[in-house]
C-alpha cells in the first residue's frame, strides 16, 4: 500500500475580516492510525489551531465527522476571521504513539490572507 500523503489542494485562500475561512485537507490513506492537527506557521513557533484528539477550539469546526472510522477529510472552518489570523496553515498527520503521538506527515500549507471589511 502506498504511503499516506496529506493533500492541501488550495495554495492560498482570501477571506474578508469577520467571515469564515475553509481550509481543505485530505489524507490518501487510513494508515497509520493517529490524529490530525492543524497549525498556523511552521517550526517551533507554530500555533496550534486544532487538535483532533484533545482541547477546546471554539472558532474551529470540522467539515466532516472526524469520528467516522473511514474518514479521510480533515478540512476545517475557522469563524470570525481577523487580520491576526493571516498566515500559512498546515494540516499535519500524527502517528499514534506511546506516550506521545509522533508527527508523521504535513500538508504543503494553505496561505490565508485577510481582506479588510469594507466600511
Amino acid at each position: 500500500e502506498e504511503e499516506l500523503q496529506v493533500i492541501q489542494p488550495d495554495k492560498s485562500v482570501l477571506v474578508a475580516a469577520g467571515e469564515t475561512a475553509t481550509l481543505r485537507c485530505t489524507a490518501t490513506s487510513l494508515i497509520p492510525v493517529g490524529p490530525i492537527q492543524w497549525f498556523r506557521g511552521a517550526g517551533p513557533g507554530r500555533e496550534l489551531i486544532y487538535n483532533q484528539k484533545e482541547g477546546h477550539f471554539p472558532r474551529v469546526t470540522t467539515v466532516s465527522d472526524l469520528t467516522k472510522r473511514n474518514n479521510m477529510d480533515f478540512s476545517i472552518r475557522i469563524g470570525n476571521i481577523t487580520p491576526a489570523d493571516a498566515g500559512t496553515y498546515y494540516c499535519v498527520k500524527f502517528r499514534k504513539g506511546s506516550p506521545d503521538d509522533v508527527e508523521f506527515k504535513s500538508g504543503a500549507g494553505t496561505e490565508l490572507s485577510v481582506r479588510a471589511k469594507p466600511s
Partner: antibody, heavy 118, light 108 residues
Framework: VQLVESGGGVVRPGESLRLSCAAS????????MNWVRQAPGEGLEWVSR????????DYAESVKGRFTISRDNSENTLYLQMNSLRAEDTAVYYC????????????WGLGALVTVSS | ETVLTQSPATLSVSPGERATLSCRAS??????LAWHQQKPGQAPRLLIY???RRATGIPDRFSGSGSGTDFTLTISSLQTEDSAVYYC??????????FGGGTKVEIK
Amino acid sequence: VQLVESGGGVVRPGESLRLSCAASGFSFSSYAMNWVRQAPGEGLEWVSRINSGGGGTDYAESVKGRFTISRDNSENTLYLQMNSLRAEDTAVYYCAKQYDWNGFFDYWGLGALVTVSS
Amino acid sequence: ETVLTQSPATLSVSPGERATLSCRASQTVGSKLAWHQQKPGQAPRLLIYDASRRATGIPDRFSGSGSGTDFTLTISSLQTEDSAVYYCQQYYYWPPYRFGGGTKVEIK
C-alpha cells in the same frame, strides 16, 4: 480551570526572580498562555505570551530583553524569568489562559506580588 | 497600535439602577472586544467576549454591545457586589494585547 502563581517576593533593582504558574483543569498543552501585570493602583498591562508548543513568544516593549517566558507542558507549568529588575516592574503578576490561539483571556490566576525596592 | 479609551473613569450608581460603560478603540477591532471585571484585591474575571457574548456563569444583567470602534458594557440593575473596576481588552490586532484604562463602578 485553576491557575496558581508562585515565586513572588521582594528583590533589589538589578536582581532576578522567576515566577511559576501551575495550571490544572484543562488541556494545558493546547493553549497559548500569557503574563499580565498590574502596578499598585494602576490598570492591567500585558507582559508576554507563549504559544501552545512553547516555541513562539511575544513581549511588551517594556520588558523585551529582560524577561523570558517559557512553559513545561509535561508539568502543566508556565514560567516568567525576570532579570535586571527595575522599580517600575513592581506589580502583581497574573498568568492568564488564552481562549484560543487568537483570543481574549478567559481565566486568570490569583496573582503574585513582585516588589523591586532598594 | 490600537489604543482603547474607557469612559467615564468613575461611575457612581445606586443599587437597582442601570450602569453604562464605554470603550472606544482608536481603529476598528471588529467584534474582537472583551470585558473583564476586577473586584478590590481580586484577580480579573472575564465577563463578555466577542463584544456581546456572556462568559460562562455571568449573570444576564451584564450585556455587551457594539462593533468597530465603539463598545458598551451595560449592567441593567446594579447590585452591591458589582462594585469593581471594569476593563475592556481588544484582540483584533496583536501583539501587544491592549487593555483600556478601566472604569471604576461605585455604589451610591
